[in-house]
Amino acid sequence: MAVTACQGLGFVVSLIGIAGIIAATCMDQWSTQDLYNNPVTAVFNYQGLWRSCVRESSGFTECRGYFTLLGLPAMLQAVRALMIVGIVLGAIGLLVSIFALKCIRIGSMEDSAKANMTLTSGIMFIVSGLCAIAGVSVFANMLVTNFWMSTANMYTGMGGMVQTVQTRYTFGAALFVGWVAGGLTLIGGVMMCIACRGLAPEETNYKAVSYHASGHSVAYKPGGFKASTGFGSNTKNKKIYDGGARTEDEVQSYPSKHDYV
């Protein structure tokens, strides 16, 4: 029950996280103009990964996709790539985890297969979350660097006088959405990996036996030892009771002297 809950919760948390990563990637407010110490408030500018927007003091806003013959900054392209990789991995992880859910029955899928799928989706969620966090952090780092460069430039002019007001840009809402979403996806992935341990069958009995309709005689399997999956070791080589079954070693296909008593 706890395993199913952990797996289900991991799935839901990851689902929310991936939805957040998609939302952050599509949002326009990755960098927003810092209005502090800026006397010109006629136009407010903010940028996303895909579009640049300007908002008038009247509230009128216009956005256009990046259109440049000189090419976009390499770092922006890198952030785009990280976010897209995060979304793709997350989406595949979600697809895999749906089939891995313990509460969903698909044909005669074994628990070991579900455990493997749960682990796979968990790893995918972890990598997806890390990609999103990395992408957002790289972008944030660029903004911090630019912010302090702009601040330094603001106060370096002829004889210490301010010549032109340099616009500074600060963190947009998308960065916070991205960080939280990446974190949730990461947590969801960890939960799926934990659930995988509980899903894996503890013990499997491997018996190579042939059954015969022979009286009421009871035989014990001479070497029937428990096979371990790796999650629980079988230190005591316990015998396994086999009802009326005989192992291949015990089956005698030729007549013996006891048959004619």
């Epitope: 960098s31 103009q33 136009v43 500018n45 940028q47 640049s52 300007v54 256009r64 996709g65 990046y66 259109f67 440049t68 013959l69 000189l70 090419g71 976009l72 900054p73 390499a74 770092m75 922006l76 952030v79 972008f139 660029m142 903004l143 660097t145 630019n146 032109t164 340099q166 616009t167 840009y169």
Partner: nanobody, 122 residues
Framework: QVKLEESGGGLVQAGGSLTLSCAAS????????MAWYRQAPGKQRELVAR???????TYADSMKGRFAISRDTAKNTVYLQMNSLKPEDTAVYYC????????????????WGQGTQVTVSS
């Protein structure tokens, strides 16, 4: 950063025409949007017209039909053709550029020129 320099302002009779120009210090291909704003004494700075990198334009309602924004990519210059000028068009006209410096990192900017005075006498 992108430095902007306006020119073409001056005194003009009502009903007359004037062309303002704004020269950018870097290729305007790297600029997302260039715009003209104006500020009359005691009033807030308002949008006149803007031209985006893809060539699309936007005009303030009161200037539609009278004003036209254009650009010359070879000269890295944006123009504002003003026709049928009225005394209420008297203001300081500012050039604005918004974009990203593509030097590897993501360095956005929103820069203004010093402004050029346009006076329309009746």
């Amino acid at each position: 950063q992108v430095k902007l320099e306006e020119s073409g302002g001056g005194l003009v009779q009502a009903g007359g025409s004037l062309t303002l120009s704004c020269a950018a210090s870097r290729s305007i291909f790297s600029i997302d949007v260039m715009a003209w704003y104006r500020q009359a004494p005691g009033k807030q700075r308002e949008l006149v017209a803007r031209i985006w990198a893809d060539g699309s334009t936007t005009y303030a309602d009161s200037m539609k039909g009278r004003f036209a924004i254009s650009r010359d990519t070879a000269k890295n210059t944006v123009y504002l053709q003003m026709n049928s000028l009225k005394p209420e068009d008297t203001a300081v006209y500012y050039c604005n550029a918004v974009g990203t410096i593509a030097d590897g990192a993501f360095r956005p900017y929103n820069n203004w020129g010093q402004g050029t005075q346009v006076t329309v006498s009746s």
